[in-house]
Each structure stands twice: as C-alpha cells, then as structure tokens.
C-alpha cells in the first residue's frame, strides 16, 4: 500500500521564496512520520525534512544548507523555502515516510513540481550623463 | 476472506500459566499489527496490547507488563499470548482482532471468537 | 494516558427511538476514533472508524460525529437487532483505550 501524493505542478517564487504544499492520501496527525523535499529529477538533493510525532513538536531541518521551514497539515506538509537562487530553478518532489505504527509505509513517486525562482527585480540605475561637450 | 481462529476455552488453577492462540488466515501475516482484548464478566474490553508480526514490534497496556507476554510464529501464521500468575482476576473472555489502517486512521475490524480463561482450584 | 468517559452506561429504549452514545477524552485525539457493538456471546463489530466513517454492510442508521474530545454515536429508528453493547475507542497512541460501555435494552 502506497501513499498518494499531490503537488502543484509548478510554482514562481518571485521573492525568492515559495511555499510548497504537498498532499497526501493518509492522515499523518497519529503516525510518527518524516516528510522530505528533494531537488531534481533523480531526487538527488534531500532540501528540506519535517519530522512529526504525535506526541511532540515538530523538527524542522535542512542538511543541504537550504533556508526552510515546515508545517503540518492533517493530511499535508507544506514547505517554506526562502533565500532561493534563481540557478535552484529545478523540480522538487515531495516525499513522505510512515516510520511508526508498523508496517512502514511510503509514497507513490509524484509528479514533483517546478520551481521557477526569479531574482530579485533592481531598480536600474540611472546613466549618469558624461561630461558635455562644448 | 480474513479468519482470526482463536484457541479453546481453558480451566486453569491460581498460580498457574496459560497459552492462548490465534491463527490468522486470508491475508498476508506478516503485513497487520494484532491487538488482544480482555473481557470479564459485567465489564467493559480492556485493551491488552498488540505484536507485530513483520518486525516483532510489541505494545503492551502498562496495567498488563509482566501479566501477559505477545509472540508469534511466522511459520504457522499464529500469535500467541501467555498469561502468567493467574488469579481469578484474570478469568474472562480474550480477543484477539486484526488492526487495519484506514488511511491513516486505526480500527479493528477483524475479530477472533475469543477463548474464555476461568481460573479456579 | 488517555481516558475515555463514555455514557450513559445503560438506557433502555423502544424499537422505532433514536439514541445517541458520547464518548469524551480527557484531550485532543483528533478523530482516532472507533465504534463497535458487541452481542452477548459474540465478539465486537466496527461500526465506525476514524469517528465518522461508516464501515461498508453497516446499516446507514448509524452514523458518527464529533471531532477534538468529544464524540457520539447516533442511531435512528433502532431496531431489535440493534440492542447490545456498544463501546468506544482511541487509536490516539498507547494504551488504545475503550470507553466503559453503553448497554442498550430494549424497553
């Protein structure tokens, strides 16, 4: 048995920062859990991981040096990822682990979704005109 | 179909032990958490535990730890629970019911026949 | 550990009535929840799970509600069959406690 997951198939993060919900098919409120965001088509780069308890808060942490932070829904992790590089551009997949009570159980692989992170927009300086000429 | 067989009723004597059966059928064993369940005469279930079969994981009701002791064997798809120090206290029905996950959500809808324990000299 | 309060602890009714079974926590097990009835000499049925989804081959005169620390079962136009035991339970971590019982006679 596998757990479904949704994403949104793409998102901007126009701010350098985006949120990003993953839903799933199962209520996560009474398991002890560890829900992950991965980058890139082979899922290569663990970004960020939310790990839950029942019984305690919630530990929120990135390995990879990635600025997130998690929430927990009851059937969705949403991920708060900010300070992105507009060269992170990738897709990212949402994954999902069912630790305790046993059987462990995970997810059916998503669709994953893109984000598209654009830089900050500056103000273009204004051309200083030369000296005139006579 | 899922069939949870329990063994039969046992006339025990104060102070002595008892093994109680559940053999399980219909479905793959090693995949579902067993959780047994007493009943006297008068009262309520009481909740006694569950054992888990794939990796032998074990959860016991602090009020049964050192009363009662889960295992199972694979092989012949049986949980067993033993039943130590029997006083007439421990004289009820037991249950043994198969737990399903529901999405995430736990309930049991598989239950043995139960087997009556009466405990006397 | 979680306790369970569950009433009343008998009532007794008429074919036809409608009664409603609470069970109340002593905190939040956010809908871990399950009903079962229970016939002398038999062993326990679901009825409901995750407090509010009826098990398939229940009869839709049973039904569930509640959320937080208190929950009920309600069941209209009660028909002989109906009358029994009836308890709750928790799935909210161990012990997964059960309710004290409702004993439902028929008046």
């Known amino acids: 048995n596998k757990i479904l997951v949704k994403q949104s198939p793409m998102l901007v993060a126009y701010d350098n920062a985006v949120n990003l919900s993953c839903k799933y098919s199962y209520n996560l409120f009474s398991r002890e859990f560890r829900a992950s965001l991965h980058k890139g088509l082979d899922s290569a780069v663990e970004v960020c991981v939310v790990y839950g308890n029942y019984s305690q808060q919630l530990q929120v942490y990135s390995k990879t040096g990635f600025n997130c932070d998690g929430k927990l829904g009851n059937e969705s992790v949403t991920f708060y990822l900010q300070n992105l590089y507009v060269n992170q551009t990738d897709i990212y997949f949402c994954k999902i682990e069912v630790m305790y009570p046993p059987p462990y159980l995970d997810n059916e692989k998503s669709n994953g979704t893109i984000i598209h992170v654009k830089g900050k927009h500056l103000c273009p300086s204004p051309l200083f005109p030369g000296p005139s000429k006579p | 179909e899922v069939k949870l067989q329990q063994s039969g009723a046992e006339l025990v004597k104060p102070g002595a032990s008892v093994r109680l059966s559940c053999k399980a059928s219909g479905y793959t064993f090693t995949e579902y958490i067993i959780h047994w369940i007493k009943l006297r005469s008068g009262q309520g279930l009481e909740w006694i535990g569950w054992?888990?079969?794939?990796?032998?994981?074990?959860q016991y009701n602090a009020k049964f730890k050192g009363k009662a002791t889960l295992t199972a064997d694979k092989s012949s798809s049986t949980v067993y629970m033993e039943l130590t120090g029997l006083t007439s206290e421990d004289s009820a029905v037991y249950f043994c019911?198969?737990?399903?996950?529901?999405?995430?959500?736990?309930?049991?809808?598989?239950w043995g026949q139960g087997t009556m324990v009466t405990v006397s000299s | 550990d979680i306790q369970m309060t569950q009433s009343p602890a008998s009532l007794s009714v008429s074919v036809g009535e409608t009664v409603t079974i609470t069970c109340r926590t002593n905190?939040?097990?956010?809908?871990?929840l399950a009903w079962y009835q229970q016939k002398q000499g038999k062993s326990p049925q679901l009825l409901i799970y995750?407090?509010?989804h009826l098990v398939e081959g229940v009869p839709s005169r049973f039904s569930g509600s509640g959320s937080g620390t208190q929950y009920s079962l309600k069941i209209t136009s009660l028909q002989s069959e109906d009358f029994g035991n009836y308890y709750c339970q928790h799935f909210w971590g161990t012990p997964c406690t059960f309710g004290g019982g409702t004993k439902l006679e028929i008046k």
């Open positions: 995750a407090a509010t």
């Open positions: 054992f888990y079969p794939g990796s032998n994981d074990i």
């Open positions: 019911a198969r737990r399903d996950d529901f999405s995430g959500y736990d309930a049991l809808p598989y």
């Open positions: 905190e939040n097990i956010y809908s871990n």
